[in-house]
Interface confidence: medium
Amino acid sequence: FPQDRPFEDTCHGNPSHYYDKAVRRCCYRCPMGLFPTQQCPQRPTDCRKQCEPDYYLDEADRCTACVTCSRDDLVEKTPCAWNSSRVCECRPGMFCSTSAVNSCARCFFHSVCPAGMIVKFPGTAQKNTVCEPASPGVSPACASPENCKEPSSGTIPQAKPTPVSPATSSASTMPVRGGTRLAQEAASKLTRAPDSPSSVGRPSSDPGLSPTQPCPEGSGDCRKQCEPDYYLDEAGRCTACVSCSRDDLVEKTPCAWNSSRTCECRPGMICATSATNSCARCVPYPICAAETVTKPQDMAEKDTTFEAPPLGTQPDCNPTPENGEAPASTSPTQSLLVDSQASKTLPIPTSAPVALSSTGKPVLDAG
């Protein structure tokens, strides 16, 4: 008899098979302790071991932790399944600038096309918005308030991160407003935050906050260990790292064992009143890159590159803080003044924050 019509539903008396009425055929009976990978297994290879929740069976038959999408800027694209990891992607309105296994190490807001440019390709979870000139020959220079408005996402066209070595690229970057980052330990041991994507898919049990082995006497590697969110200051005291939890701040550098977290104003804002390792008051400023031209792009995955307009055409749209003062240039990376000469020649792509140096020259900030 054919297998899907077994005599008396006994599967020819074969004890290693059973008859499944739903599919009307004989199915292989998985040994005790193993789970079927499909409704009606046909052979021993259709049976598997069962992993813990939030773990999946990888290609080497190892139970491996699924990545987590718990960071604010990530959403779950596909769930954690028995044989595949959960996959995370940047939440709507953001794109991935630094990928990680089954996730994204660094998400950025989609750029808003500046005045005189229109959306050629909308931003996705993987790619930034691609802009193109609205129409040849037209160059509105901040003629209407609409052209000088702050983008809805609160971002400015962003610069490409400076290249980093393969050994540090995924671990050394984290998203805007992302979770805590752990710094390089003694400038050598690069560690990963407990929830950040792991290259092997398993959560790190050693967050790198203390030596993994007991400290040998006289070892220079041993140090006082402070509480989380505290750092060891120059006087050897555990001091609280500043918090970047205010809506207008983003983390610039993480709280490390020997240095405080530093905060800066979020994209689209500038520091009006400085504070130690942070900014006491951020004020918005508009984007007036009115006459930008599209520069051909070599990298398929990265985003549009803009060139600043010729000398003398920079629109006059500098903001004034609420009290009427000119915004203070409180740190080398937060000056409002841009030297037209410098900006004329430097193409500014859109995948990482642009830092403006005290000399006025844009600096590519790796974040």
Partner: antibody, heavy 119, light 111 residues
């Protein structure tokens, strides 16, 4: 009948190691996760980790910071738990327990092995 | 890790009375439509014995007077009518996240 038989009581000195065995019978040893749980005198239960004898895969409780090592010998259907750098607070009864697939419960337990750490 | 808090620590009741034991988790134990909460009974000098799995399923061979309920973070073990052999310590356990954790236990003693 499923049975888990553990090795006898041990007295150890601080800083030393102990290796407890758990011999399984009555089921397909390779196909079930073997868990290890300990219980200090008069205290609650503490999950230490688990091993899948079929391939040696393990999950550990990070609390033990690499002090615990789980192994399994398929040829003798025996699981082992080794705890190193013993201290007095490791004095406890150590249990092995088979984990059910599907609901993750531990349905069969060994009788327990008392490990006393004392100088 | 997920913290399980059992209450009360001790329950003094007489045979025939109803026992209600509580276990609260610090985060949800939901997993694909079920709660990965387990209940065990332990008597002196013995290993724990599985009573309830998946929050409400009674293990084979366990008397019907034992029942489990709850979902998310709040769970209850109920013994409808206490028998003399039910006086023991009861532990809840979560398997939602590694490491698995146990509650501190509730001792049900004879009043």
């Amino acid at each position: 009948e499923v049975q888990l038989v553990q090795s006898g009581a041990e007295v150890k000195k601080p800083g030393s190691s102990v290796k407890v065995s758990c011999k399984a019978s009555g089921y397909a040893f390779s196909s079930y996760w073997m868990n290890w749980v300990r219980q200090a005198p008069g205290q609650g239960l503490e999950w230490m980790g688990q091993i899948y004898p079929g391939d040696g895969d393990t999950n550990y409780n990070g609390k033990f910071q690499g002090r615990v090592t789980l192994t399994a010998d398929k040829s003798t259907s025996t699981a082992y738990m080794e705890l190193s750098s013993l201290r007095s607070e490791d004095t406890a009864v150590y249990f092995c327990a088979r984990r059910i697939n599907g609901n993750f419960a531990m349905d069969y337990w060994g009788q327990g092995t008392l490990v006393t750490v004392s100088s | 890790e997920i913290v399980l808090t059992q209450s009360p620590a001790t329950l003094s009741l007489s045979p025939g009375e109803r026992a209600t034991l509580s276990c609260r988790a610090s985060e949800s134990l939901e997993y694909y439509g079920t709660s990965l909460m387990l209940w065990y009974q332990q008597k002196p000098g013995q290993p724990p014995k599985l009573l309830i799995y998946s929050a409400s399923n009674v293990e084979t061979g366990i008397p019907a007077r034992f029942s489990g309920s709850g979902s998310g973070t709040d769970f209850t073990l109920t013994i409808s009518s206490l028998e003399p052999e039910d006086f023991a310590v009861y532990f809840c356990q979560q398997r939602r996240k590694v490491p698995s954790t146990f509650g501190g236990g509730t001792k049900v003693e004879i009043k």
